[in-house]
């Protein structure tokens, strides 16, 4: 089953996907597509990298992280409701049946119209945009979207999630990345 990520209309959505290159600059092809991962490649490709560079991308889809270090997380700019759905991140690792395939579900919510109080903006500076647990690869990464819209109940929930993610770090040995080589 797909792990769910959320964003609001008009925001940028973030879909995490990582691997660790065997050596610096020793990259493997990666593709992102709209739709679940098929046998070959990605369906409806929106972005692709090769062994050297990003060699194909479409408007609004880009890699914000350092893909040369294996951060191939996808950013979708200014999302609309039509961007909802399953996205495939495929890391094309050489070898027998080595490809890593991740299906990520993006849920787009209608934009809130109420302005965010000052107190919530203060909270944004104190917490990162993304909570990452060192679990089973990208499937364990949760994005919080735009934090200024968070309410006090959610702040409590976030504190619990931060605590849980630290606990997860203690409990899980496997990294949040795919290691190659």
């Amino acid at each position: 089953s797909e792990v769910e990520y959320r964003a609001e209309v008009g925001q940028n959505a973030y879909l995490p996907c990582f691997y660790t290159p065997a050596a610096p600059g020793n990259l493997v092809p990666v593709c992102w597509g709209k739709g679940a991962c098929p046998v070959f490649e990605c369906g409806n490709v929106v972005l692709r990298t090769d062994e050297r560079d990003v060699n194909y991308w479409t408007s609004r889809y880009w890699l914000n992280g350092d893909f040369r270090k294996g951060d191939v997380s996808l950013t979708i700019e200014n999302v609309t409701l039509a961007d909802s759905g399953i996205y495939c991140c495929r890391i094309q690792i050489p070898g027998i049946m080595n490809d890593e395939k991740f299906n990520l579900k993006l849920v787009i919510k209608p934009a809130k119209v109420t302005p965010a109080p000052t107190r919530q903006r203060d909270f944004t500076a104190a917490f990162p945009r993304m909570l990452t647990t060192r679990g089973h690869g990208p499937a364990e990464t949760q994005t919080l979207g735009s934090l200024p819209d968070i309410n006090l109940t959610q702040i409590s929930t976030l504190a619990n999630e931060l605590r849980d993610s630290r606990l997860a770090n203690d409990l899980r040995d496997s990294g949040a990345t795919i290691r190659i080589g």
Partner: antibody, heavy 123, light 107 residues
Amino acid sequence: QVTLKESGPGLVKPSQTLSLTCTVSGGSISSGGHYWSWIRQHPGKGLEWIGYISYSGSTYYNPSLKSRLTISVDTSKNQFSLKLSSVTAADTAVYYCATAYYDILTGYPFDYWGQGTLVTVSS
Amino acid sequence: EIVMTQSPATLSLSPGERATLSCRASQSVSSYLAWYQQKPGQAPRLLIYDASDRATGIPARFSGSGSGTDFTLTISSLEPEDFAVYYCQQRSNWPITFGQGTRLEIK
């Protein structure tokens, strides 16, 4: 246009290794987007996908054949090959090599097949 | 593995008639379904990919539809050269699997 041609012995003895080569012309075997595949068709029967090796070196084998199967690429000769060990009469089939090519813009699977070669397993 | 079931096994029609071939998957294959045509002594030829997109050079009388588990290949008006065996194929899950084929024969 890419063309593919299978070559190898038409008769293999039981328990031996079936070896086939597919020669690619009209394109480079190492070019991006290509998935080099082997498919077989038992006489009068349907199609069975054996496995593929991608331009990036990813290899996928049909689980039913995985323990006996090796697919590899020789870029210097622009060829890829199939080795199937410990064959029995059940491996008698027409063997096709093929490529699926995923266009970088559309993801379209251009589909090219060889004409096929019949391999009979018999003593 | 995903099992692909085609029906009917044999379809007998005359040139000019409409042919409807069905393919059902044992689990969802999204739209990752292709249709192939095979004539005796020849390799299969791709007709339709991703359930409904016609491959290059395929006449407009061939069309595909469906998603999930149920798919249809329609030939709007049969030409003499269309009589052959037709296979559906899924590329959603490994291993790639084919249906057992539908033989389209002249009535």
